[in-house]
């Protein structure tokens, strides 16, 4: 699931035990404070209509695997968020699967069809910018700009886990024209849908569009990074971008492998393995501390692929901000 959340064990996809994805693993949510506002957001994220109840997750068979972790202690939504990830969350304190949260939504299935099997942004720099393509019956199709809107772009960005839509109606450059069949036009999204397939549209394959009308979308990359305070772009205190806000990274567990991934991602050569004293010369940051306990193997192409605690969860001060010095 691109949204990293699902309901398991119900009679249909819109009810069941709540499961969320973290670092490629699916786990449950503790029912500590779980209420109808949280379910409302979850139902919206899944394209399942309105919330109808907060049943205990233990009601749904089969029960959670013993090895499966409870990942979140509490979710606190106001009810207006688009996704559960936008709600306040606390990492787990103490919770067993007897306390798993459940949810049921009113609308079990979207009435719209066809149902494509995926969406991607192609020929862009990274997976969060590019030409909109949808997959249907193992074939990728482009999407015509006719009827495309900011609301549709918001859905795509959300579906891809790419944050908010930044650029929504740019035509493709000639080199980025699609060579695939044109899937559909007249996308009529409300902006609340969990996936593009939940939006009504004109019949697929029946349109008068050309590839110079292919839709290009750019989303805020959820995981940008930079080095600040140094003499050049390849040295300084590390900051990462999340929810449109730059924040620092705590040095707990930080080492050579993490340095190498940052230098690689920035195109800054290799890490110069700076001393503790050299790292401290960039001073402490201010504002958010976004990441803690980052663990890389060194093979990753992006810090995004490394393990870390939930965004914003740390036990650090800015005196522990990471700095990195690359060869340039």
């Amino acid at each position: 699931s691109p949204s990293g959340v699902r309901l398991v064990g119900g009679l249909h996809r819109c009810e069941g035990r709540v499961e969320v994805e973290q670092k490629g693993q699916w786990g449950t949510v503790c029912d500590d404070g779980w209420d109808i506002k949280d379910v409302a957001v979850l139902c919206r994220e899944l394209g399942c209509g309105a919330a109808s109840g907060t049943p205990s997750g233990i009601l749904y068979e089969p029960p959670a695997e013993k090895e499966q972790k409870v990942l979140i202690q509490s979710v606190s939504c106001t009810g207006t968020e688009d996704t559960l990830a936008q709600c306040e969350q606390e990492e787990v304190y103490d919770c067993s699967h007897d306390e798993d949260a459940g949810a049921s939504c009113e609308n079990p299935e979207s009435s719209f069809s066809p149902v494509p099997e995926g969406v991607r942004l192609a020929d862009g720099p990274g997976h969060c910018k590019g030409r909109v393509e949808v997959k249907h019956q193992n074939q990728w199709y482009t999407v015509c700009q006719t009827g495309w809107s900011l609301r549709a772009a918001k859905v795509v960005c959300r579906q891809l886990g790419c944050g908010r839509a930044v650029l929504t109606q740019k035509r493709c450059n000639k080199h980025a024209y699609g060579r695939k069949p044109i899937w559909l036009s007249q996308m009529s999204c409300s902006g609340r849908e969990a996936t593009l397939q939940d939006c009504p549209s004109g019949p697929w394959g029946k349109n008068t569009c050309n590839h110079d009308e292919d839709t290009w979308v750019e989303c805020e990359d959820p995981f940008d990074l930079r080095l600040v305070g140094g003499d050049n772009l390849c040295s300084g205190r590390l900051e990462v971008l999340h929810k449109g806000v730059w924040g620092s990274v705590c040095d707990d567990n930080w080492g050579e492998k993490e340095d190498q991934v940052v230098c690689k991602q920035l195109g800054c050569g290799k890490s110069l393995s700076p001393s503790f004293r050299d790292r401290k010369c960039y001073g402490p940051g201010v504002g958010r501390i976004w990441l803690d306990n980052v663990r890389c193997s060194g093979e990753e192409q992006s810090l995004e692929q490394c393990q870390h605690r939930f965004w914003g969860f740390h036990d650090c001060t800015h005196q522990e901000d990471v700095a990195v010095i690359c060869s340039g």
Epitope: K69, V70, E90, Y93, D94, C95, F313, H314
Partner: antibody, heavy 114, light 112 residues
Framework: QSVEESGGRLVTPGTPLTLTCTVS????????INWVRQAPGEGLEWIGM?????NTYYANWAKGRFTISRDSTTVDLKITSPTTEDTATYFC???????????WGQGTLVTISS | ELDLTQTPASVSAAVGGTVTISCQSS????????LSWYQQKAGQPPKLLIY???TLASGVPSRFKGSGSGTQFTLTISGVQCDDAATYYC????????????FGGGTEVVVK
């Protein structure tokens, strides 16, 4: 369900000491364990905890002085460099102020003296 | 630094009387009500009386009552019994980019 502390003894200042909390009937992958101490004639003092997801949290005063770790049935508290002020009865316990459960051991006495 | 201040440090009450203990937190506890009250007698571990600020733990007599929210909490013992002579502690759970617990300094209840 029960928890039991062990490892308390007389040690000289600066000698690292590890206390062990042995749990039974508790799945540590689902439950958090706290360490609390009580100096003679004094009140209860929270040291820190290890959560069900294996994250550790410490009181500000305890950071760097104590380390909490666990395996499948035990939770250890290491006093890295004890001083005479660390003389106390040390309890391990499962509690969470919003929930009805509360499970405490009988405590183990640690005496730091030269 | 989180701080739970309990008052008074010591209180004396006659059998059948009422004891009120206050607990003030330097910041709001988790979800405004994650505060519990414990009773401890000499040589024993603490015993849970009240959790979630006002909910009576199993097997605890109804003469114990908890109230309050946010940063200000109260434990009231009505119709004090001889067996209530003990030290009472408030305990709060907090969340701020991580979990924390704290105990109040304790209140000794002497029954005359």
């Amino acid at each position: 369900q029960s928890v039991e502390e062990s490892g308390g003894r007389l040690v000289t200042p600066g000698t690292p000491l590890t206390l062990t909390c042995t749990v039974s009937g508790i799945d540590l992958s689902s439950y958090a364990i706290n360490w609390v101490r009580q100096a003679p004639g004094e009140g209860l003092e929270w040291i820190g905890m290890i959560s069900s997801s294996d994250n550790t949290y410490y009181a500000n005063w305890a950071k760097g002085r104590f380390t909490i770790s666990r395996d499948s049935t035990t939770v250890d508290l290491k006093i890295t460099s004890p001083t005479t002020e660390d003389t106390a009865t040390y309890f391990c316990a499962r509690f969470y102020a919003g929930r009805s459960y509360s499970l405490w051991g009988q405590g183990t006495l640690v005496t730091i003296s030269s | 630094e989180l701080d739970l201040t309990q008052t008074p440090a010591s209180v004396s009450a006659a059998v059948g009387g009422t004891v009120t203990i206050s607990c003030q937190s330097s910041e709001s506890v988790y979800k405004s009500n994650y505060l519990s009250w414990y009773q401890q007698k000499a040589g024993q571990p603490p015993k849970l009386l009240i959790y979630a600020a006002a909910t009576l733990a199993s097997g605890v007599p109804s003469r114990f009552k908890g109230s309050g929210s946010g940063t200000q909490f109260t434990l009231t013992i009505s119709g004090v019994q001889c067996d209530d002579a003990a030290t009472y502690y408030c305990q709060g759970t907090y969340y701020s980019s991580g979990w924390y617990n704290a105990f109040g300094g304790g209140t000794e209840v002497v029954v005359k």
